[in-house]
Amino acid sequence: LVPHLGDREKRDSVCPQGKYIHPQNNSICCTKCHKGTYLYNDCPGPGQDTDCRECESGSFTASENHLRHCLSCSKCRKEMGQVEISSCTVDRDTVCGCRKNQYRHYWSENLFQCFNCSLCLNGTVHLSCQEKQNTVCTCHAGFFLRENECVSCSNCKKSLECTKLCLPQIENVKGTEDSGTT
């Protein structure tokens, strides 16, 4: 089976790398525009220059192209705790990230939120906090992990997952109560 190619890919594959086929005349290959520029006018004929113009402020192209418009620069989303790591330039989009001691959680492919790295109070750091992953904590005896925090087994209800981890403590508490009645 022949893989399906989009119209643009089909047109581009007829010309050598770095060139694209003229939309009105498929016998002409025009040179693509450099990153940081966009296509203003197609080349008038073979061996003639493509009319490329620099992207305006607030827009960019990150690779060679024959786009009719530059792409809009991304904005860092303050409500998600994002901060700007580097500003948008004509040939590179804005880079957004998180503050120190925070990590990114991706809700979707193109949306992340910044959260504070867990400190592992009442536990130890098993894996340090990374750019896209929270600290992995191991809890001390008498504590269990809930929402990546070490919580005292005294807060463990029978219906929760913690019963397995806290079982010795729960039995201990019962034992102490029983011994107190004699």
Epitope: K75, R77, K78, E79, M80, H105, W107, Q113, F115, N134, E147, N148
Partner: nanobody, 119 residues
């Protein structure tokens, strides 16, 4: 106590429209970023859209961009989702939620409203 109550779901034909509402109480609605998420049958939660407190620069998932519009009325403590050009793949239970603060889990969300897109 935080309460979120979605309404407006129903059965609609492909290409049709629906407007979902979410009535909020128990917190200062005007200070919070609000979120719409959805869960299609047998699938995980999908982030659909969110809107900051001032209503400016909302976010849309690529799958709904240009078709859905999120809005809010802070005087009525109500969040909306206008859904146009509906497709079969938009069939899901839609939930409104508060943007999480402590960690990557949703603490507060409503009971959901079912949207079915079918001919």
């Amino acid at each position: 106590e935080v309460q979120l109550w979605e309404s407006g779901g129903g059965l609609v034909q492909p290409g049709g429209s629906l407007r979902l509402s979410c009535a909020a109480s128990g917190f200062t609605f005007a200070h919070e970023t609000m979120v719409w998420v959805r869960q299609a049958p047998g699938k995980g939660l999908e982030w659909v859209s969110h809107i900051p407190p001032d209503g400016q620069d909302p976010f849309y998932a690529d799958s709904v961009k240009g078709r859905f519009t999120i809005s809010r009325d802070n005087s009525k403590n109500t969040l909306y989702l206008q859904m146009n050009s509906l497709r079969a793949e938009d069939t899901a239970v839609y939930y409104c939620a508060l943007l999480p603060k402590r960690g990557p889990w949703i603490d507060y969300w409503g009971q959901g409203t079912l949207v079915t897109v079918s001919s």
